[in-house]
């Protein structure tokens, strides 16, 4: 059970693995479902800038390089904790909230909606 | 800037849009790269459950259904934060804590370092 | 912390079998890939084979397909290397890793390798 407030201490750990945790990031280039990064930044929010995933195409790249329609590029979301001041410019006192961001693309075989 | 130690209220807000968060839950068994989902828990931590997407195969599935080794699955992953207990049990005092979880998977084209 | 416990070398004959055995603990939880790698005298680390720990996929290097079979335990949290039909040119020690990124894992990431076991294949 967790109390409804509580201290924190924002000197952040870092829970590293046995390799490199940048490894990720060019994937993004590599992937038949290619994303790119927007910024979203909000000097209210801890942290202040998260990076948002927008799938390139709407068809997966095939092996010719080429964007399949008969394939979808979706986005992988994950909802994920950040601390929202609060009040409004609050120092020391936050809120903990909840969003909902896409960390990048899968590519996956269309659902097929059938029109009568 | 941010000081040392805050308050939290964890009373949650939830910021997500009207579109259904669990939308992509159906995306780990239909991508090229396919995952499972593997629960995390750990009283120690807030949040307490955290779902880690493990790929299913070394390569990705091709029009076939087979696995196509020429392709690559691999984890798309996101460094989030969350609430370590500090010290252990602590009921209200917490650390912010940076881990790294595997989100999903997605098919990339290999870079061939040691796979001939 | 990975923790990563290799036996089953030895001193064998050419054309001799060994079976290699792999202990692995401290894995994070996105762990789907387990991989055999081997570094003989003189030369760098190089890539053996790969399993998934969810499908039982392999993958193998060039040199070793047909001869060599990996196979896992997930209940242990073990992976073994069957080698068959070896040659002095299979001859050094082998380490076995988690491998994170799956084929895409690059030798020069890993932070913790073990020990490793001596494979020495005489003619």
């Known amino acids: 059970n967790f109390p409804r407030t509580v201290m924190v201490n924002l000197n952040i750990h870092n829970r590293n693995t046995n390799t490199n945790p940048k490894r990720s990031s060019d994937y993004y280039d590599r992937s038949t479902s290619p994303w790119n990064l927007h910024r979203n930044e909000d000097p209210e929010r801890y942290p202040s800038v998260i990076w948002e995933a927008k799938c390139r195409h709407l068809g997966c790249i095939n092996a010719d390089g080429n964007v399949d329609y008969h394939m979808n590029s979706v986005p992988i979301q994950q909802e994920i904790l950040v601390l929202r001041r609060e009040p409004p410019h609050s120092p020391n006192s936050f809120r903990l909230e909840k969003i909902l961001v896409s960390v990048g693309c899968t590519c996956v075989t269309p659902i097929v909606h059938h029109v009568a | 800037n941010f000081p040392r130690t805050v308050m939290v209220n964890l009373n949650i807000h939830n910021r997500n849009t009207n579109t259904n968060p669990k939308r992509s839950s159906d995306y780990y068994d239909r991508s090229t790269s396919p995952w499972n989902l593997h629960r995390n828990e750990d009283p120690e931590r807030y949040p307490s459950v955290i779902w880690e997407a493990k790929c299913r195969h070394l390569g990705c599935i091709n029009a076939d259904g087979n696995v196509d080794y020429h392709m690559n699955s691999v984890p798309i992953q996101q460094e989030i934060l969350v609430l370590r207990r500090e010290p252990p049990h602590s009921p209200n005092s917490f650390r912010l804590e940076k881990i790294l979880v595997s989100v999903g998977c997605t098919c990339v084209t290999p870079i061939v370092h040691h796979v001939a | 912390q990975v923790q990563l416990v290799e036996s089953g070398g030895d001193l064998v004959q050419a054309g001799g079998s060994l079976r290699l055995s792999c202990a692995a603990s401290g894995l994070t939880g996105s762990s789907y890939a387990m991989g055999w790698f081997r570094q003989a005298p003189g030369k760098e680390r190089e890539f053996v084979a790969a399993?998934?720990?969810?499908?039982?996929?392999?993958k193998y290097t060039d040199s070793v397909k047909g001869r060599f079979t990996m196979s896992r335990d997930n209940a242990k949290k073990q992976v073994y290397l069957e080698m068959n039909s070896l040659k002095p040119e299979d001859t050094a020690v082998y380490y076995c890793?988690?491998?994170?990124?799956?084929?895409?894992?690059?030798?020069?990431?890993?932070?913790?390798w073990g020990q490793g076991t001596q494979v020495t294949v005489s003619s």
């Open positions: 890793n988690d491998m994170p990124y799956g084929l895409d894992t690059r030798m020069d990431e890993y932070v913790y």
């Open positions: 399993i998934s720990w969810i499908s039982g996929d392999t």
